[in-house]
Amino acid sequence: MRRGPRSLRGRDAPAPTPCVPAECFDLLVRHCVACGLLRTPRPKPAGASSPAPRTALQPQESVGAGAGEAALPLPGLL
C-alpha cells in the first residue's frame, strides 16, 4: 500500500490561510489562488455504483486530514 505524504510545511504555512474562502494558499508560490471550482470529487471508475474504499491515496486525491481539518479531493491541481 502506498504511503500518503505527511503534512510538510509545518511552521512555513500560516494558520489560518490569508485567503478568502474561494481561494487556496499555494505554498509553491506563497500566494492565494482560485480553487473553489476545483473542489469536486474524483469521478468514479466506469461501472462503479458506489465509491471504492479509499485504502490508499491516489494521485489527485487529497492528503489525509489532521484532527479537525477538512481535506477535500481535487480532480485537478493548480
Epitope: G10, F25, L27, E61, S62, V63, A65
Partner: antibody, heavy 126, light 107 residues
Framework: EVQLVQSGGGVVQPGRSLRLSCAAS????????MHWVRQAPGKGLEWVAV????????YYGDSVKGRFTISRDNSKNTLYLQMNSLRDEDTAVYYC???????????????????WGQGTTVTVSS | EIVLTQSPSSLSASVGDRVTITCRAS??????LNWYQQKPGKAPKLLIY???SLQSGVPSRFSGSGSGTDFTLTISSLQPEDFATYYC?????????FGGGTKVEIK
C-alpha cells in the same frame, strides 16, 4: 489512458522562433497546472516554465525569461511554448509535464511532475 | 535559487545490490523533495514525492527518506530494469530545480 503528446520541434537558426505544442488526453486538462522542462544533449533536467490551470499565473526560469512564453488553450486541451530569439544554448529535448499537487485544507502542496510527454527535440544551429 | 547536489554522480552496481543515492539542498526545503528515474531516450518518471511517498505503480523496492536539507533514495534490491539515471527535484519554491543526476550502471 492519461497521455501528453508533443509536437513542433525541429531545427531552427539562432534568433528565430519556434512553437511547441503538447496535446493532453485522458484527464481533465483544464484542472491542471502544466510545466515545460528541457534537457540539453548529455546534460541534466532544467525547469523552463509553469502555467496555472486557468492561465492566471505563469513563471519562468531565468534563462528563458523574456524570450519564451507559456500558454494554453483549455478548449483544445493543449499546452504551448512559444520560443523567440532562440540561442544555441536552447538546443535540448523539451518535455511538457503535469503539475502534481495535493490539497490539504486550504493549502496546496506541490509534489513535482507526475505525467510527462515523450519529448520533442529543438536544435538551434546556423 | 535552491541548489540540489546529488552524489555520487555515477555508480556501478550488480543486480540484487542495495543502492543509495543522496541529494543535498542548499537551504531547508522541508520534505518537498521528489525523485525521478530516466532511461536513455525516454521521459523522466516520478518515483517518490514528498521525500518518502511512493508514487502509484512504483515498485516497493524504491524508498525515500530525509527532510530539511539531506535526502536519500534507496533501491533495496537492484533489478535489471533499474539501471538508469536518477534525479532529485525540489518543489519548495520557484524556480523548480533538479539535482545533477546519478547514473546507475551495471558492474
Amino acid at each position: 489512458e492519461v497521455q501528453l503528446v508533443q509536437s513542433g520541434g525541429g531545427v531552427v537558426q539562432p534568433g528565430r522562433s519556434l512553437r511547441l505544442s503538447c496535446a493532453a488526453s485522458g484527464f481533465t486538462f483544464s484542472s491542471y497546472g502544466m510545466h515545460w522542462v528541457r534537457q540539453a544533449p548529455g546534460k541534466g533536467l532544467e525547469w523552463v516554465a509553469v502555467i496555472w490551470y486557468d492561465a492566471s499565473n505563469k513563471y519562468y526560469g531565468d534563462s528563458v525569461k523574456g524570450r519564451f512564453t507559456i500558454s494554453r488553450d483549455n478548449s483544445k486541451n493543449t499546452l504551448y511554448l512559444q520560443m523567440n530569439s532562440l540561442r544555441d544554448e536552447d538546443t535540448a529535448v523539451y518535455y511538457c509535464a503535469r503539475r502534481f499537487t495535493h490539497l490539504r485544507g486550504q493549502y496546496i502542496e506541490d509534489y513535482g511532475l507526475d505525467v510527462w510527454g515523450q519529448g520533442t527535440t529543438v536544435t538551434v544551429s546556423s | 535559487e535552491i541548489v540540489l547536489t546529488q552524489s555520487p554522480s555515477s555508480l556501478s552496481a550488480s543486480v540484487g545490490d542495495r543502492v543509495t543515492i543522496t541529494c543535498r539542498a542548499s537551504q531547508s526545503i522541508s520534505s518537498y523533495l521528489n525523485w525521478y528515474q530516466q532511461k536513455p531516450g525516454k521521459a523522466p518518471k516520478l518515483l517518490i514525492y514528498a521525500a518518502s511517498s511512493l508514487q502509484s505503480g512504483v515498485p516497493s523496492r524504491f524508498s525515500g527518506s530525509g527532510s530539511g536539507t539531506d535526502f536519500t533514495l534507496t533501491i533495496s534490491s537492484l533489478q535489471p530494469e533499474d539501471f538508469a539515471t536518477y534525479y532529485c527535484q525540489q518543489s519548495y519554491s520557484i524556480p523548480l530545480t533538479f539535482g545533477g543526476g546519478t547514473k546507475v550502471e551495471i558492474k
